[in-house]
Interface confidence: medium
Amino acid sequence: IWELKKDVYVVELDWYPDAPGEMVVLTCDTPEEDGITWTLDQSSEVLGSGKTLTIQVKEFGDAGQYTCHKGGEVLSHSLLLLHKKEDGIWSTDILKDQKEPKNKTFLRCEAKNYSGRFTCWWLTTISTDLTFSVKSSRGSSDPQGVTCGAATLSAERVRGDNKEYEYSVECQEDSACPAAEESLPIEVMVDAVHKLKYENYTSSFFIRDIIKPDPPKNLQLKPLKNSRQVEVSWEYPDTWSTPHSYFSLTFCVQVQGKSKREKKDRVFTDKTSATVICRKNASISVRAQDRYYSSSWSEWASVPCS
Amino acid sequence: RAVPGGSSPAWTQCQQLSQKLCTLAWSAHPLVGHMDLREEGDEETTNDVPHIQCGDGCDPQGLRDNSQFCLQRIHQGLIFYEKLLGSDIFTGEPSLLPDSPVGQLHASLLGLSQLLQPEGHHWETQQIPSLSPSQPWQRLLLRFKILRSLQAFVAVAARVFAHGAATLSP
């Protein structure tokens, strides 16, 4: 058993049939010594008396809010949550496995630049009685500070018969050094509580590996005289790190016909313009990637050829 | 060329070679098989790699003030990785694929380090970890980790030389 926060305790249980469970001793937070009784949740049934209560926690029915009273007055509460371990593996029932970039990916994180700011998100099908708390640091043995906000519901989607809820959180490294080569990964820890079930999820990454620039901005076409060619130009996204002579991007320019089956023409360039042939009913798209480190490409910015 | 205590490197040449190093490091990486590094125990060889840290003056401001600190750090790293790529970890079994770019990568690391430090000038270089051959089983993981680490190192070096070529070239 360990304390998650004040008056909230997590009991770690091996979850198999006929498991003996964990013996837990609760102590009433009061100077009083006698006349103390204990109840669980809303029930008025007295579970025991005295300053301490010893219980055998085996299942969710044994978890919940234990309250000690004296003469009708509440003295203190202890909320017991369960953390299940089945076949040596901690349960992951609350969050959905996003399966990208590999199986057992529950948390996904992205950064728009090297400033030390990043966003993480996760998915669940649970809509009520759900709380999250997020902690983060750089490194684990001698952790350096990363400050995370509160997790918020950022999207709802319908997937077949189910509703899926996306939560996200923004974090900022306290003393970020954008130009340095990271040697210690960022660690993100999410505590999830659904009713009386506790689970924790972790992710470990370097900012450089989760970089995904915003799409290029101000995408424009300029027809070239007496030619089917056009000059496409664009600019670095506002959110990208500066100076651009140091934090450089590379770009992919694509000409795509109306039909998905049509052959795509692609050009790669380090410049912020390119000359391409504009076909009728086609569109021109540009995306960006860090020039020197192969992290994710941005989403496409597009304009129609006409 | 970067001479200790003084003159500027050939920024444009360094930029071109460091960008080539980035390309080679990324084309070499898939050849060692995909493994999740953080699920594996850390090996000494990759714990000791020289990183370009915050105080090394490799940020735009630091380069403007005095690029020598940063160039010395990059030089140290290039020599370190050049030694690792020439070590038994890469030259031993299991054999790399026939068209592996590791040989080219090794030669380019040497080329860039020589651009930064011509013959006859000696910057202190970091102690190379023991190059005694590990078992072939362990080599694959080490190759993977070293190349992942090298990708990060050469990305910072390439940024330094790109910025230098754009803003510090005579």
């Epitope: - | 098989g33 493994m35 051959p133 072939p136």
Partner: antibody
Framework: EVQLVQSGAEVKKPGASVKVSCKAS????????MNWVRQAPGQRLEWMGV????????TYNQKFKGRVTITVDTSASTAYMELSSLRSEDTAVYYC???????WGQGTLVTVSS | DIVMTQTPLSLPVTPGEPASISCRSS???????????LNWYLQKPGQSPQLLIY???TRASGVPDRFSGSGSGTDFTLKISRVEAEDVGVYYC?????????FGSGTKLEIK
């Protein structure tokens, strides 16, 4: 074209030493380790050791420890295997083989006889 | 050391018929990258060994497709779908997963 060309046959007395050379061509000599393998008449192949031509670091089969020394001369793109304190059971064909074992020398017969 | 046990010692085959050679290692040669570090060689009379198969099942350059390798972490098989006269010689398996690299005792393939 990758080629490994070994020195000629040798006849040695028990207790003597022999040094076999292996000249490599057609590839960058320092990019690949060089293995040495031997085969006694009618016996299975036996790996003796390996050298990294960049640094001269070696790993030997414990069976030969103390008797075998593998060296290289990178300027001549040549690897050497020296076996000392020869005994009659060291009579064998000795091969050099490049890392990957796709390329082998033609073999050098060493006969140990009094 | 990893011990490589090869069977049979001798294999008489009729040309055009298939042939199969087995090799067993005393320790798994399957690494966590999913690759199995086992080689097969053919040594023709009076010649150096030639690499046939590496990584348990990958044919070396120039090796005819009648040769194939398969197996698990410790049990391996070299198959020749239709034996030809030029296939005679001694076949060896070898592990390169761990030092010292070790070879099987060899299987002599001869034409009936």
């Amino acid at each position: 074209e990758v080629q490994l060309v070994q020195s000629g046959a040798e006849v040695k007395k028990p207790g003597a030493s022999v040094k076999v050379s292996c000249k490599a061509s057609g590839y960058s000599f320092t990019d690949h380790n060089m293995n040495w393998v031997r085969q006694a008449p009618g016996q299975r192949l036996e790996w003796m050791g390996v050298i990294n031509p960049n640094y001269g670091t070696t790993t030997y089969n414990q069976k030969f420890k103390g008797r075998v020394t593998i060296t290289v001369d990178t300027s001549a793109s040549t690897a050497y295997m020296e076996l000392s304190s020869l005994r009659s059971e060291d009579t064998a064909v000795y091969y050099c083989a490049r890392r990957g074992f796709a390329y082998w020398g033609q073999g050098t017969l060493v006969t140990v006889s009094s | 050391d990893i011990v490589m046990t090869q069977t049979p010692l001798s294999l008489p085959v009729t040309p055009g018929e298939p042939a199969s050679i087995s090799c067993r290692s005393s320790k798994s040669l399957l690494y966590k990258d999913g690759k199995t570090y086992l080689n097969w060689y053919l040594q023709k009379p009076g010649q150096s060994p030639q690499l046939l198969i590496y990584l348990m099942s990958t044919r070396a350059s120039g090796v005819p497709d009648r040769f194939s390798g398969s197996g698990s972490g410790t049990d391996f098989t070299l198959k020749i779908s239709r034996v030809e006269a030029e296939d005679v010689g001694v076949y060896y398996c070898q592990q390169i997963a761990e030092y010292p690299f070790t070879f099987g005792s060899g299987t002599k393939l001869e034409i009936k």
